[in-house]
């Protein structure tokens, strides 16, 4: 008998395994990034794995601990901040999340010179926001909606505002709608470059209607959460900007910055503040009808101790085809002359590009151009401008970093990242040290993320900061799905899509298809980034094909695509998902009887409308925390894209674009509706109304609520959610458990 070995047992194929749902829920394949906490041109801080705060000097190659993990642990600190004069560190503990960006915490000040905590005049708790001045070690903080100033950490505080009141007046911090939809920060105060002045916003929410929902907790009676939340068409917050001299705060007190006349004539928003010098500040304002933005440059008048904003220093940005800006109106990056600036806005061809404004917007000099978009200006130095764009190889879902030499004429452009690790890295961001002496590049994919340190003069790589070696090793025996990014050309519209294919994908076979959709205005889902997530598992283990499609309304491909959805939300986004599905069916490997769609938030709205489109394309679908009517969502976001829900404006489309209006059409699909009861963002009201309409239409559907969970459905709810959705899809696709 001749014994012949069967296939070698440790062959690659046999040791490879598919992803499991457990892998995803445990975060087994999560990656790390490294963002240096720059403290000078050549030094940065980093929190080590064992929780020491370590200072790195790039030029000497040396590093040392400035704050031990023992000190951190003594107050249970999870975060820190070094004062610019390096005398003190604030230690942050008792983190308590509020909304998307906001949280409260307890702060301790540690004196590095003598290795002790500062005693006497300790900070109150909990604090809503705290920051060092940009020079020295002054402290500004917000406590109970009022702003306080300390000249030194051990000094008694000087109270700047006195009218702060919970849910009524907010000083130095935004209210709900400004935090979520305008500033995208937890703070609304800004130090001047040398710490002479402190600017802050005051938000008056007195007349804003309140959203109230139950928080069930563990008590006998539920608590009621009340948030001033302006829905579309409702009364908005009233904003005022003040500036105080921090050297002599009691001398003249806070001085209000005037609002440009053309803005103040009707409802308006403040959109951002940028200090230029200690005595020059730039404010951006926006009309409530968000197609007119005004950038106003104001100067300090020593004689009157006031701020003057001459009309000659007002720059108007207006959109005739949509709203002003992309998601937000871009912010200016000032040059060294302290009056001219660089800014991204639409060029005459409808692509967002960098412009240089010296006197008027009309005379702006276009710095970048092409059928692609400039996305972010990172840094302007005396001789270089660093920015990101999606120009390279015409893939809108990539991000590369470019340097334009502005010190020479004509300016020359160099792509810093395009050819560094071309297969692995096509989506970058960057972080620059003072004067761009050094910078870190953080690559998010499509390969395993990697963070590197570079010389700001030569662009030479100095060292790898984080390369995710453990992740790379862990993935060696995992059968990951294949990913491809391609485009469909349909009726003069380019639809970019990402397709995630099972590991042993065979074009001659038929696969169930799941569409994952977001689709919100100025969003982008088709990006060249690395991810091992739920849909990776569905492809790897469950053999599904997953597709993401960027349709009309999405970003970074020009204004024609972006502004196509203006005043018509819920129409073209849905059409384009349906068009793409039809094209995927034509490719021949999709089982057209097993097609599903799912989305979260705006994606829940689009998935609901797609399911109710009456096309018969979708067997089933899931909506997580969907918007169901634009009348229920925040004014700042909604009105940007939809105008006002009034008869003489756009009420008709507000009414036509609800999920409830299409209740009948859910009869022939399996629908799973999911929402957290404590969603402060997309209120549970949205799903409650969908459910009511479906019940009234006698349409069967499935639903799951998550008690006391917000828009993120975090913690144990996440595990439950993805397990539940997996069961639903497997049942829909007749896949065995």
């Amino acid at each position: 008998i001749v014994l012949r070995p069967s296939r070698v047992h440790n062959s690659e194929e046999n040791t490879m395994r598919a992803l499991t749902l457990k892998d995803i829920l445990n975060g087994t394949f999560s990656y790390k990034t490294f963002f240096p906490n720059w403290i000078s041109g050549q030094e940065y801080l980093h929190q080590s794995a064992d929780n020491n705060i370590v200072l790195y000097n790039i030029e000497t190659g040396q590093s040392y601990t400035i704050l031990s993990n023992r000190t951190m642990k003594s107050v249970n600190a999870s975060n820190y901040g070094l004062s610019p004069d390096r005398q003190f560190v604030y230690l942050e503990s008792d983190y308590s999340k509020l909304w998307r960006y906001s949280y409260t915490a307890t702060y301790y000040i540690y004196d590095l010179s003598n290795g002790e905590f500062v005693r006497g005049n300790e900070l109150p708790r909990p604090i809503q926001y705290l920051c060092w001045s940009p020079v020295g070690s002054k402290l500004a903080y917000v406590y109970q909606n009022n702003i306080y100033l300390k000249q030194r950490p051990g000094d008694p505080p000087f109270q700047i505002t006195f009218n702060g009141r919970e849910n009524k007046i907010f000083n130095g911090i935004p209210d709900w709608v400004y935090e979520e939809e305008m500033l995208a920060t937890k703070y609304a105060l800004w130090w001047s470059p040398n710490g002479k002045f402190l600017a802050y916003a005051e938000f008056n929410d007195t007349d804003i209607p309140v959203i109230a929902y139950s928080y069930y907790g563990d008590e006998q009676y539920p608590r009621t959460i009340n948030i001033p939340y302006p829905k579309a068409g409702a009364k908005n917050p009233v904003v005022r900007i003040f500036i105080i001299d921090t050297t002599y705060p009691a001398y003249v007190g806070p001085q209000e910055v005037p609002v440009p006349a053309m803005i103040a004539s009707s409802d308006y928003y403040f959109s951002w503040l940028t200090w230029v010098t200690d005595e020059r500040v730039c404010l951006q304002w926006l009309k409530r009808v968000q197609n007119v933005s005004v950038l106003s440059i104001c100067d300090f008048r020593e004689d009157w101790q006031t701020w003057d904003c001459p009309k000659t220093q007002e720059h108007i940005e207006e959109s005739r085809t949509g709203w002003a800006g992309g998601f937000f109106v871009s912010t200016p990056v000032f040059s060294y002359d302290a009056i001219s600036y660089y800014k991204i806005f639409s060029d005459k061809d409808g692509y967002k590009h960098i412009h240089y404004i010296k006197d008027t917007v009309e005379n702006a000099i276009q710095i970048t151009s092409g059928k692609w978009e400039a996305i972010n200006i990172f840094r302007v130095t005396q001789d270089s401008l660093f920015y990101s764009s999606n120009e390279f190889e015409e893939y809108p879902g990539r991000r590369n970093i470019y340097r334009i030499s502005i010190g020479s004429y004509p300016p020359s452009k160099k792509c810093v990242t395009c050819h560094l690790r071309k297969e692995r890295c096509q989506y970058y961001t960057a972080s620059f040290s003072d004067y761009a002496k050094y910078y870190a590049l953080v690559c998010y994919g499509p390969g395993i993320p990697i963070s590197t340190l570079h010389d700001g003069r030569t662009d030479q790589e100095i060292k790898i900061l984080e390369e995710n070696k453990e992740l790379e090793n862990a993935l060696k025996n995992i059968q990951l799905p294949k990913e491809e990014i391609k485009k469909l050309e349909v009726d003069e519209i380019t639809l970019w899509y990402k397709m995630i294919l099972p590991p042993q994908f065979d074009r001659s076979k038929k696969y169930p298809l799941l569409i994952q959709v977001y689709g919100g205005p100025c969003s982008q889902s088709v990006r060249s980034v690395f991810a091992v997530n739920w849909i990776s598992y569905l492809a790897s283990k469950e053999g599904m094909v997953i597709a993401l499609v960027d349709g009309r309304g999405t970003a970074f491909q020009g204004d024609k695509l972006l502004y196509a959805v203006y005043r018509k939300l819920g129409v073209y986004e849905v059409e384009d998902q349906i068009t793409a599905v039809r094209k995927f069916i034509e490719m021949g490997f999709i089982d057209e009887k097993r097609i599903a769609i799912w989305g979260w938030s705006y994606g829940g709205y689009v998935s609901s409308l797609a399911l109710a489109s009456g096309t018969g394309l979708f067997k089933c679908g899931i909506a997580v925390a969907p918007v169901s009517s634009w009348e229920y969502y925040a004014s700042v976001y909604t009105e940007r894209f939809m105008g006002l829900p009034t008869k003489d404006d756009n009420l008709e489309h507000y009414k036509n674009s609800t999920v409830m209006a299409r209740a009948e059409y859910f009869r022939n699909v399996d629908y799973l509706l999911i929402h957290g009861t404590a969603d402060d963002n997309v209120h549970f009201q949205n799903s409650a109304q969908i459910a009511k309409a479906l019940v009234n239409a006698q349409v069967d559907f499935q639903a799951m609520w998550y008690s006391d969970q917000n828009h993120g459905l975090s913690g144990l709810s996440t595990n439950h959610l993805y397990t539940h959705m997996t069961h639903f899809l497997k049942q829909c696709f007749s896949l065995s458990d």
Partner: nanobody
Framework: QVQLQESGGGLVQAGGSLRLSCVAS??????????MGWYRQAPGKQREWVAG???????TYADSVKGRFTISRDNAENTVFLQMNNLKSEDTAVYYC??????????WGQGTQVTVSS
């Protein structure tokens, strides 16, 4: 191991001047200019920071000495200086140099005594 040797202190009249020197040695200083600072401790008080200088010679001062003290360095010699002009009685203290900010665990030299008489 960090070793720091301060010198140049002494007794001086109010309004007078002194120049302090500090020689730094140890592996952390072997490959170039680390950010360095001057600190001081007055009798019965806690040690406080006075001035700082980075490897690229960017300087920062405590408000109490701004305009009177000047920090400088000789990178080749691993030496940091503190030129103190228009001295006041409240400048009386033991002066130390160290990394800026100091490392943990602490490594401090002997310091150099500055006494300003009025």
């Amino acid at each position: 191991q960090v070793q720091l040797q301060e010198s140049g202190g002494g007794l001086v009249q109010a309004g007078g001047s002194l120049r302090l020197s500090c020689v730094a040695s140890g592996t952390i200083f072997s490959s170039g200019a680390m950010a360095m600072g001057w600190y001081r401790q007055a009798p019965g008080k806690q040690r406080e920071w006075v001035a700082g200088i980075t490897g690229s010679r960017t300087t920062t001062y405590a408000d109490s000495v701004k305009g009177r003290f000047t920090i400088s360095r000789d990178n080749a010699e691993n030496t940091v200086f503190l030129q103190m002009n228009n001295l006041k009685s409240e400048d009386t203290a033991v002066y130390y140099c160290n990394l800026w900010p100091p490392s943990r665990p602490d490594h401090w030299g002997q310091g150099t005594q500055v006494t300003v008489s009025s």
